[in-house]
């Protein structure tokens, strides 16, 4: 169930994450799947395990194979498999399909190209970018953190983009390259009157006095990039920032794009240490865009502390 493909080039660093998650404090054991032989954790080895990460510094073609990781949590062990393939370096410029990471699409409004897998590495700027093997030069190209920004994107900007960076491990430097295709698409989105998915209109949320409570305002606005779209919470018709109660804060969720292409936003209202007076407030989830504003109202009610759910759940 938990198998992940990873690939790299010989003589470059490759770092692979266990496909099963866990907390940093949980032990992760790595094995060569074929032999069940444990992978060492000592950093003096060329291939070694470091918690959730398996490091090839540098990788060799012979390292190709399946690796097993077992996350040992306080409850159950969880197993993942990393299917690693190390390829010989190509002499020509063409990057074969099997070395390509997922294609990204950009448009005039959004032209970020993220460098794949870079978050696994200990890298420092500068991050170098190449298109079809040519180093990118000119003011239209800006390497920012772990991504490339292209200004005024045109259809000619489509192509294969390679990022190159240096991974540092205990003072030793290793090169890493990663390539992905970039396509340019016309913005063909549309905008709708906001649709609030949560909370339901006039929902009553049960809370416990003295405990923390979360309310999520979730709404969709159409397809594609939205020019103006926002979700927010109001208390008794007042913006959270103006209400002046530090226990009650709103926190922006991630922009969400669902499989049906809808552009949706979340805003979480966090109420710390719920008090009696919080039950008297009216909580409004507002979703607005160029078409207008939609409002769903929520009220809080006290959860009976001797309720069965409170005891066992």
């Amino acid at each position: 169930k938990f198998s992940k493909q990873s690939w790299g080039l010989e003589n470059e660093a490759l770092i692979v994450r266990c496909p099963r998650q866990g907390k940093p404090s949980y032990t992760v054991d790595w094995y060569y799947s074929q032999t069940n032989k444990s992978i060492p954790t000592q950093e003096r080895n060329r291939v070694f395990a470091s918690g959730q990460l398996l490091k090839f510094l540098p990788a060799e073609v012979a390292d190709s194979g399946i690796y097993t990781c077992i996350v040992r949590s306080p409850t159950f062990n969880r197993t993942g498999y990393a299917n690693v393939t190390i390829y010989k370096k190509q002499s020509d410029c063409n990057v074969p399909d099997y070395l390509m990471y997922s294609t990204v699409s950009g448009s005039e409004k959004n032209s970020k190209i993220y460098c794949p897998t870079i978050d696994l590495y200990n890298w420092t700027a500068p991050l170098e970018w190449f298109k079809n093997c040519q180093a990118l030069q000119g003011s239209r190209y800006r390497a920012h953190k772990s991504f490339l920004v292209i200004d005024n994107v045109m259809t000619e900007d489509a192509g294969d983009y390679t990022c190159k960076f240096i991974h540092n491990e205990n003072g030793a430097n290793y090169s890493v390259t990663a390539t992905r295709s970039f396509t340019v698409k016309d913005e063909q989105g549309f905008s709708l009157f906001p649709v609030i998915g949560a909370p339901a209109q006039n929902e009553i949320k049960e809370v416990e006095i003295g405990k923390n409570a979360n309310l999520t305002c979730s709404a969709c606005f159409g397809k594609g990039t939205q020019f103006l779209a926002a979700v927010l919470w109001q208390l008794n018709g007042t913006k959270i920032t103006d209400f002046g109660e530090p226990r009650i804060q709103q926190e922006e969720g991630q922009n969400q794009s669902f499989s049906n292409g809808l552009a949706c936003l979340d805003m979480v209202l966090r109420i710390a240490d719920v008090k009696e007076e919080d039950l008297l407030l009216q909580y409004d989830c507002l979703a607005l865009n160029l078409h207008g504003l939609r409002r769903h109202t929520v009220r809080l009610s006290r959860k009976n502390p001797i309720d069965h759910h409170s005891i066992y759940c």
Partner: antibody, heavy 121, light 107 residues
């Protein structure tokens, strides 16, 4: 087909003993944890505990520790939940559920059909 | 014990609506969270494991997200057969604990 088949409904009096069963088939019974979940009438799910039939290792929720016994007979691929002295508050639906192997786990992926236990004088 | 707080406790939505259920853990549980569907008179059924992985055979309209303490379960387009109670469950620590459940009804 992987399945867990539970014993039939029981009607008992307070103070009586009871042992309900859960028979596993279609998979390696000794390699998977089997657990029990209680659902009182009109209420939610409560995890009671688990057993690893391969070595009879058990884990209990503190709420059920000492109240029930969980056992297994690997020769007949069956897990058991038993009470030595039933109370009216034990009236509930009891489900057995498979909890993954000693090396891998991804939720309670196979459930029995449930056994209704009614305790009434 | 880790407390799992699920909300709302019940909701009513129309066929085709997007339905969202939230689950909050009283402490960090990484992504060790599962979602179950229980139809009236039936045993629960695993839908999502490890917060976001769809169990084999489960329709793609069901999805899950989140990590740490805050988790979301979504039905992208509610169908009549989705009438059920949905439970979240953590398995980061013993005892395993369930949320109080969310009863989903059709308007």
């Amino acid at each position: 087909e992987v399945q867990l088949v539970q014993s039939g409904a029981e009607v008992k009096k307070p103070g009586e003993s009871l042992k309900i069963s859960c028979k596993g088939s279609g998979y390696s019974f000794t390699n998977y944890w089997i657990g029990w979940v209680r659902q009182m009438p009109g209420k939610g799910l409560e995890w009671m505990g688990i057993i690893y039939p391969g070595n009879s290792d058990t884990r209990f929720s503190p709420s059920f520790q000492g109240q029930v016994t969980i056992s297994a007979d690997k020769s007949i691929t069956t897990a058991y939940l038993q009470w030595s002295s039933l109370k009216a508050s034990d009236t509930a639906m009891y489900y057995c559920a498979r909890h993954g192997t000693s090396s891998d786990y991804y939720g309670l992926d196979v459930w029995g059909q449930g056994t209704t236990v009614t305790v009434s004088s | 014990d880790i407390q799992m707080t699920q909300s709302p406790s019940s909701l009513s939505a129309s066929v085709g609506d997007r339905v969202t259920i939230t689950c909050q853990a009283s402490q960090d549980i990484s992504n060790y969270l599962n979602w179950y569907q229980q139809k009236p008179g039936k045993a629960p059924k695993l839908l999502i494991y490890d917060a976001s992985n769809l169990e084999t055979g489960v329709p793609s309209r069901f999805s899950g997200s989140g990590s740490g303490t805050d988790f979301t379960f979504t039905i992208s387009s509610l169908q009549p057969e989705d009438i059920a109670t949905y439970y979240c469950q953590q398995d980061d620590n013993f005892p395993l604990t369930f949320g109080g459940g969310t009863k989903v009804e059709i308007k």
